[in-house]
Interface confidence: low
């Protein structure tokens, strides 16, 4: 049994397991009544005989079921998440790169490409990556806009990732998209350049599909005083990863207490 | 100062605040080193003089920023959430109701309408509602499908709510969408019938916009053995709310300890 | 994680989730909850050794922080980490009610 | 909630988040963390009175569960509820590093 050096703060004693169980059971008695705001168990005098009505059982079962799309409890932090994560950032390939040429003309989308060699330099192994965020500086926006993020998939196909409803704003604002899974994929594959597409949300019956929002790094022919913020504040990937040497240390000490 | 009845399990004693602070500070010393996997503070011998490089400060600032779209820490449970929630369900208005007539023809969408008087009967005041889920029973699905949920907004306009990527499946499966905010709105307004639309996700350049997924309650002319599950398992709203009498009790006891 | 998976299958002395099934009738003497008949409430128990003092060798101690005092508390304590709700069915007079009680089932514990 | 808002502006004796600003230089004697110079670490302190026993009157006790023992623990304990991360800048040799440390700042506490 464990004894602390400084008894003033020690809370650990030889504990009688049965006493703890009894206390827990009594506490649950109070907890349930308290949650129902009952001072005592309800009278059962008027309860009709026989089984519970079908509709009530159906409702009880609906409540018990975990269904697709319902958020489960947050997962406890894995051991690796306890340790510090090194933060790096990889800027988007500049827009004068030839990769952008075949994607330039669209009114409903902008494209962002990243050099995977830079990503690999920052995160040598996919398993080390704990979070990747795509950060975009959106400039002023006059009207609300619903945007969608896609990942370049193969040849000319794009895979939907997520969406965001952007409120009008008088000031620039950073947007962040969680792209951890995508960047992990890129780190596992051999490609040299990988990319995202930010598009206006197009509903099946609407025809107004123009991307109204200005993302810093794409705006050309603007006031000169914007030029300074373009370079540094163009879209980038913010990466949080376990440094390689720390990960090796972690693997070698994978033992329970 | 607090003294527990049962000393065997009491963890509370007269506590010296300064001692606790000292212990916390020393614990933080260990915590930071431990998170960085350092046995001792790193040597500062080679640190270049002068301020931190711009790029490092920019990176540090990026890390500190809470930006739009980044999930904040989960909010602590409000007091009202401690108490039990009554669970009820309101079934979708049946599809032979005239409200559906003007929406029947679309290949990319299905429509689900709800009677707000039934909702109000279950939840008399919007503030009492703590969660509302739209539950749909999807039948077999041969191909992956990306669907979107919309809320009927005004006249013929629809407001986007959320989306889901449905994996192919050989068996029926319940889907759940969190629509708490929408139902709270409906309870605050005067409308008699309110509704949702489930649509195929339409990208700006894709033309294949057919809703492939079958939702129970809409499939007609199918095998007879489905008919039995249609009525009871048609889309419904699962509501969790504080009962009115419990809420009044809560308001009257709004005092700190 | 100090969850049911690990704790129920080990003889861990330190902080862990412990098995406890509550039968409403037998343990609480209640007949008024119609569904379920009982549930796995579980509970957290076990010391979270205070593992830092100025005379302790850094290197010995550092690896233990993660388990025993990840939050660097002055007096770490074994408490629930993941909790789940419990729906119940009971009657008020002649009317059956389904209610959901939050945070009733302990799935895992942590030193905090 | 037992958060900085409530606790820093009250004289709550029971479980609450307590103010603690750590200055790396003054409190830890460290010069190696270049940014930030310190941070609001805070900590949880105060009793969570054990409020249930068979001879206690139900009605008196029930209203207190929410605050003192919402998890119906056998020995409730004052622990962090909401935590936030802390990014730091330090050097390894000549190379500056930015690292994020999870769960370093206590924003609120709870009896658990």
């Amino acid at each position: 049994d464990y004894k602390d050096d400084d008894d003033k703060l020690s809370t650990s004693k030889t504990i009688d397991m049965e006493l703890v169980k009894r206390k827990r059971i009594e506490a649950i008695r109070g907890q349930i009544l308290s949650k129902l705001r009952l001072a005592s168990p309800p009278s059962q005098g008027e309860v009709p005989p026989g089984p519970l009505p079908e509709a009530v059982l159906a409702l009880y079962n609906s409540t018990r079921d975990r269904v697709a799309g319902e958020s489960a409890e947050p997962e406890p932090e894995p051991e690796a998440d306890y340790y510090a994560k090194e933060v790096t950032r990889v800027l988007m390939v500049e827009t004068h790169n030839e990769i952008y040429d075949k994607f330039k003309q669209s009114t409903h989308s902008i494209y962002m490409f990243f050099n995977t060699s830079e990503l690999r330099e920052a995160v040598p192994e996919p398993v080390l990556l704990s979070r990747a965020e795509l950060r975009l500086l959106r400039l002023k926006l006059k009207v609300e806009q619903h945007v969608e993020l896609y990942q370049k998939y193969s040849n000319n196909s794009w895979r939907y990732l997520s969406n965001r409803l952007l409120a009008p704003s008088d000031s620039p604002e950073w947007l962040s998209f969680d792209v951890t899974g995508v960047v992990r994929q890129w780190l596992s594959r051999g490609g040299e350049i990988e990319g995202f597409r930010l598009s206006a949300h197009c509903s099946c019956d609407s025809r107004d599909n123009t991307l109204q929002v200005d993302i810093n790094g794409f705006t050309t022919g603007r006031r000169g005083d914007l030029a300074t913020i373009h370079g540094m504040n163009r879209p980038f990937l913010l990466l949080m990863a376990t440094p390689l040497e720390r990960a090796q240390h972690l693997q070698s000490s994978r033992h329970r207490r | 100062d607090y003294k527990d009845d049962d000393d065997k399990l009491s963890t509370s004693k007269t506590i010296d605040m300064e001692l606790v602070k000292r212990k916390r500070i020393e614990a933080i010393r260990g915590q930071i080193l431990s998170k960085l996997r350092l046995a001792s503070p790193p040597s500062q011998g080679e640190v270049p003089p002068g301020p931190l490089p711009e790029a490092v400060l920019a990176l540090y600032n990026s890390t500190r920023d809470r930006v739009a779209g980044e999930s904040a820490e989960p909010e602590p449970e409000p007091e009202a959430d401690y108490y039990a929630k009554e669970v009820t369900r309101v079934l979708m208005v049946e599809t032979h109701n005239e409200i559906y007539d003007k929406f029947k023809q679309s290949t990319h969408s299905i429509y689900m309408f709800f009677n707000t008087s039934e909702l109000r009967e279950a939840v008399p005041e919007p503030v009492l509602l703590s969660r509302a889920e739209l539950r749909l029973l999807r039948l077999k699905l041969k191909v992956e499908q990306h669907v979107e949920l919309y809320q009927k907004y005004s006249n013929n306009s629809w407001r986007y709510l959320s989306n889901r990527l449905l994996a192919p499946s050989d068996s029926p499966e319940w889907l759940s969408f969190d629509v708490t905010g929408v139902v709270r709105q409906w309870l605050s307004r005067g409308g008699e019938i309110e509704g949702f639309r489930l649509s195929a996700h339409c990208s700006c350049d894709s033309r294949d916009n057919t809703l492939q997924v079958d939702i129970n309650g809409f499939t007609t002319g199918r095998r007879g053995d489905l008919a039995t599950i249609h009525g009871m398992n048609r889309p419904f709203l699962l509501l969790m709310a504080t009962p009115l009498e419990r809420a009044q009790h809560l308001q009257s006891s709004r005092h700190r300890r | 994680a100090l969850d049911t998976n690990y704790c129920f299958s080990s003889t861990e002395k330190n902080c862990c989730v412990r098995q406890l099934y509550i039968d409403f009738r037998k343990d609480l003497g209640w007949k008024w909850i119609h569904e379920p008949k009982g549930y796995h409430a579980n509970f957290c128990l076990g010391p979270c050794p205070y593992i830092w003092s100025l005379d302790t060798q850094y290197s010995k101690v550092l690896a233990l922080y993660n388990q025993h005092n990840p939050g660097a508390s002055a007096a770490p304590c074994c408490v629930p980490q993941a909790l789940e709700p419990l729906p119940i069915v009971y009657y008020v007079g002649r009317k059956p009610k389904v209610e959901q009680l939050s945070n009733m089932i302990v799935r895992s514990c942590k030193c905090s | 909630a037992l958060d900085t808002n409530y606790c820093f502006s009250s004289t709550e004796k029971n479980c609450c988040v307590r103010q603690l600003y750590i200055d790396f230089r003054k409190d830890l004697g460290w010069k190696w963390i270049h940014e930030p110079k310190g941070y609001h670490a805070n900590f949880c302190l105060g009793p969570c009175p054990y409020i249930w026993s068979l001879d206690t009157q139900y009605s008196k006790v029930l209203a207190l569960y929410n605050q003192h023992n919402p998890g119906a623990s056998a020995a409730p304990c004052c622990v962090p509820q909401a935590l936030e991360p802390l990014p730091i800048v330090y050097y390894v040799g000549r190379k500056p590093k930015v690292e994020q440390l999870s769960n370093m700042i206590v924003r609120s506490c709870k009896c658990s």
Partner: antibody
Framework: QVQLVESGGGVVQPGRSLRLSCAAS????????MNWIRQPPGKGLEWIGY???????YRANWARGRFTISRDNSKNTLYLQMNSLRAEDTAVYYC????????????????WGQGTLVTVSS | DIQMTQSPSSLSASVGDRVTITCQAS??????LAWYQQKPGQPPKLLIY???TLEWGVPSRFSGSGSGTDFTLTISSLQPEDFATYYC??????????FGQGTKVEIK
């Protein structure tokens, strides 16, 4: 169009309390940090305190005993509760939005209301 | 608390002049410093943050420099609309925020 409109000012006797409101529009209020600042007539600016999106507050040491900051995100409104008012609390009270392009600049006042005058006098 | 000291407390200058205002912090605040402009009857307006970053839409004649304890606001060529009071403000990681006492720029 971003707007912050302070209200609740006026003449109040020493020792009394007053609650100021700041109604926000034109931006997503619940995800913004907000500040209160005051300016005594003909003098400089004094920071009173700040409230984070979650409701966490920081206040200047001098404001800790008597001034409380709160917010109601559902009403897009920020509040300043002032108790035991003194003559030296006479000032124009401003609410201001925290700049958040860089997170730790929450204390940088990016957008200000026009202010409301509080006069403490018997 | 960090004390911020501005100098001068007032100055007279003509249109076209180069104007420099300094601000000194009682302890190091890295580059956690902002500058504001206030005209009579109006709320202050943010000019510069992070010691040297120009706020969106602020003319490039305004610039800021400094780090640690000593900071400077410079107006390279004073314009008629620049006559106002200027405040510096610290926002380092400690408990509080501090404004300087202000510098009034008047027409000579």
């Amino acid at each position: 169009q971003v707007q912050l409109v302070e209200s609740g000012g006026g003449v109040v006797q020493p020792g009394r309390s007053l609650r100021l409101s700041c109604a926000a529009s034109g931006f997503h209020f619940s995800s913004e940090a907000m500040n209160w600042i005051r300016q005594p007539p003909g003098k400089g600016l004094e920071w009173i305190g700040y409230i984070y999106t979650s409701g966490t507050t920081y206040r200047a040491n001098w404001a800790r005993g008597r001034f409380t900051i709160s917010r109601d995100n559902s009403k897009n409104t920020l509040y300043l509760q002032m108790n035991s008012l003194r003559a030296e609390d006479t000032a124009v009270y401003y609410c201001a939005r925290g700049w958040h392009i860089f997170g730790h600049h929450y204390w940088v006042m990016h957008f200000w209301g026009q202010g409301t005058l509080v006069t403490v006098s018997s | 608390d960090i004390q911020m000291t501005q100098s001068p407390s007032s100055l007279s200058a003509s249109v076209g002049d180069r104007v420099t205002i300094t601000c000194q912090a009682s302890q190091s605040i890295s580059t956690y410093l902002a500058w504001y402009q206030q005209k009579p009857g109006q709320p202050p307006k943010l000019l510069i943050y992070a010691a040297s970053t120009l706020e969106w839409g602020v003319p490039s004649r305004f610039s800021g420099s400094g780090s640690g304890t000593d900071f400077t606001l410079t107006i390279s060529s004073l314009q008629p609309e620049d006559f106002a009071t200027y405040y510096c403000q610290s926002y380092s990681d400690g408990d509080s925020v501090g404004f300087g006492q202000g510098t009034k720029v008047e027409i000579k």
